[in-house]
């Protein structure tokens, strides 16, 4: 009689994450008498995945009844499958005795797994920066397999060129990564803007995967000052305002300094947005100007998310008589009939 | 070691249950499987059936089958067989024994649970 | 169902004898077949397993040989703790069934 073979037709198998795989293995004899066992890897260090014989093994089922002694097929399913489970597999049969001894094994089938990559994650710069200035944006996706991945950016729908991308690890492993960091330079007009990475694998079936940033996170616009004065009813009075514009994040303190002296300060709360996603807010003072012998230097001191203060000053000449010396240029920021008769008193929208 | 430890002697009346149980130690419980044999005084051996402690598949003697359920409890390391409809014939010694999924020996046995079924 | 036919039913010998065990299956078994040794009041012990395979701890005065339908236990140089009785076992398919027994007594 021809001796036994064992016979695992499929060199390789491909199979997705989380499915089940079948491995193939049948013998072409029932003698000698002895159990099939299955293992990953050869040599001393292969690991034992299935033996006929005894041990417990949930997650494999044998594909026909292996109880029965005639049977020749010693396929088997192994569930769930996950990236730790590629490997080539080999089907090997024994030869009854104290201890059993292997007789023969199969060529072996290779198993790969295809393995989705995760949500892909992008991260931005930890400190805020201005327009005009570079930041980087990091974007990572893990666990997928095989290796080939594309990685794109973009910016508000326009593809992004500076970048640099890698894949982990250099050599073969069950699973890889990705990391890629590109460069973005910011505008004024990048608060509502989105930053993109775009991740396509063969498992995505050309559905791919988006990580995005928003750019109002990490962007920072400083506001522009203007001081005004408007005319006011009453002879001794004047209204200076200070016009905060453009600026983003809200984070706002404004200051007014009369001759260099802290008059009141006030944190921005009801301001008004621009359609770019900026702030406008406008702040003003009802200034006396019969307490006042000399001119007076207002100064509107601005602290921005915490940044270093930017200031504006008006000169109110006291000497002459109050007229108005400057453009309301904001004047669909006004709009209060309310008035002050003491110079601390404001109004700010 | 490896040990069978089978429950204490039963006296049952006909048409009544019994329930042995067998708690095995010193191997992977999961790993094997539990034969009751059982041995009618001054007769031979006779096998009743097995279970697989690792994924519970159960096979029955056709002779028993419907009068004999056999289960495992994997967290108590235990196996139970439990026989309904008891007459007098049942009178026996009962045997748990570990095998294999292969060579289906019996190479480790409990000392044996009598039971002994009488009006 | 594969039946197990053991002879003889029992024997008689002499410690240093020879002894010889058979059993016959209904069908083709292939290698598996088991036997068992029991004490009076004991468990079953086993000796050999597919047919051949010495049991870890089991005296080598033991041994199996057969395939197919024919096997024997063969015990060379009986001694004094040998005389119990010897059962086989066919394990070929299920219900596994066992020889009616052969009970070894001293001469």
């Known amino acids: 009689e021809e001796e036994l073979q064992v016979i695992q037709p499929d060199k390789s198998v491909s199979v997705a994450a989380g499915e089940s795989a079948i491995l193939h293995c049948t013998v072409t004899s029932l003698i000698p008498v002895g159990p099939i066992q299955w293992f990953r890897g050869a040599g001393p260090a292969r690991e034992l995945i299935y033996n006929q014989k005894e041990g417990h093994f949930p997650r494999v089922t044998t594909v026909s009844e292996s109880t029965k002694r005639e049977n020749m097929d010693f396929s088997i399913s192994i569930s769930n499958i996950t990236p730790a489970d590629a490997g080539t597999y080999y089907c090997v049969k024994f030869r009854k005795g104290s201890p059993d001894t292997e007789f023969k094994s199969g060529a072996g089938t290779e198993l790969s797994v295809r393995a989705k990559p995760s949500a892909p994650v992008v991260s931005g710069p930890a400190a805020r920066a201005t327009p005009q200035h570079t930041v980087s944006f990091t974007c990572e996706s893990h666990g997928f397999s095989p290796r080939d991945i594309t990685l794109k950016w973009f910016k508000n729908g326009n593809e992004l060129s500076d970048f640099q991308t890698n894949v982990d690890p250099v050599g073969e492993s069950v699973s890889y990564s990705i990391h890629s960091t590109a460069k973005v330079v910011l505008t004024r007009e990048d608060v509502h803007s989105q930053v993109i990475c775009e991740v396509a694998h063969v498992t995505l079936q050309g559905d791919p995967l988006r990580g995005t940033a928003n750019l109002s996170e990490t962007i920072r616009v400083p506001p522009t000052l203007e001081v005004t004065q408007q005319p006011v009813r009453a002879e001794n009075q004047v209204n200076v305002t200070c016009q905060v514009r453009k600026f983003y994040p809200q984070r706002l303190q404004l200051t007014w300094l009369e001759n260099g002296n802290v008059s009141r300060t006030e944190t921005a709360s009801t301001v008004t947005e621009n359609k770019d996603g900026t702030y406008n807010w406008m702040s003003w003072l009802l200034v006396n100007v019969s307490a006042h012998r000399d001119d007076v230097k207002l100064t509107c001191q601005v602290e921005h998310d915490g940044q270093p203060a930017v200031s504006k000053s008006h000169d109110l000449k006291v000497s002459a008589h109050p007229k108005e010396q400057g453009s309301n240029t904001a004047a669909e920021n006004t709009g209060s009939n309310e008035r002050h008769h003491h110079h601390h008193h404001h109004h700010h929208h | 070691q490896v040990q069978l430890v089978q429950s204490g002697a039963e006296v049952k009346k006909p048409g009544a249950s019994v329930k042995v149980s067998c708690k095995a130690s010193?191997?992977?419980?999961?790993?094997?499987?539990m034969h009751w044999v059982r041995q009618v005084p001054g007769q031979g051996l006779e096998w009743m059936g097995w279970i697989k402690a690792g994924n519970a598949e159960i096979k029955y003697s056709q002779k028993f089958q419907g009068r004999v359920t056999i289960t495992r409890d994997t967290s108590a390391t235990t196996a139970y067989m439990e026989l309904s409809s008891l007459r007098s014939e049942d009178t026996a010694v009962y045997y748990c024994?570990?095998?294999?999924?292969?060579?289906?020996?019996?190479?480790?046995w409990g000392k044996g649970t009598t039971v002994t079924v009488s009006s | 169902d594969i039946q197990v036919t053991q002879s003889p039913s029992s024997l008689s010998a002499s410690v240093g004898d020879r002894v010889t065990i058979t059993c016959r299956a209904s069908?083709?078994?292939?290698?598996?077949l088991n036997w068992y040794q029991q004490k009076p009041g004991k468990a079953p012990k086993l000796l050999i397993h597919?047919?051949?395979s010495l049991q870890a701890g089991v005296p080598s005065r033991f041994s199996g040989s057969g395939s197919g339908t024919d096997f024997s236990l063969t015990i060379n140089s009986l001694q004094p703790e040998d005389f119990a009785t010897y059962y086989c076992q066919q394990s070929y398919s299920t219900p596994l069934s066992f020889g009616g027994g052969t009970k070894v007594e001293i001469k």
């Open positions: 010193g191997y992977t419980f999961t790993s094997n499987a």
């Open positions: 024994a570990r095998g294999d999924y292969y060579y289906y020996y019996m190479d480790v």
């Open positions: 069908q083709s078994i292939s290698d598996f």
């Open positions: 597919a047919a051949s």
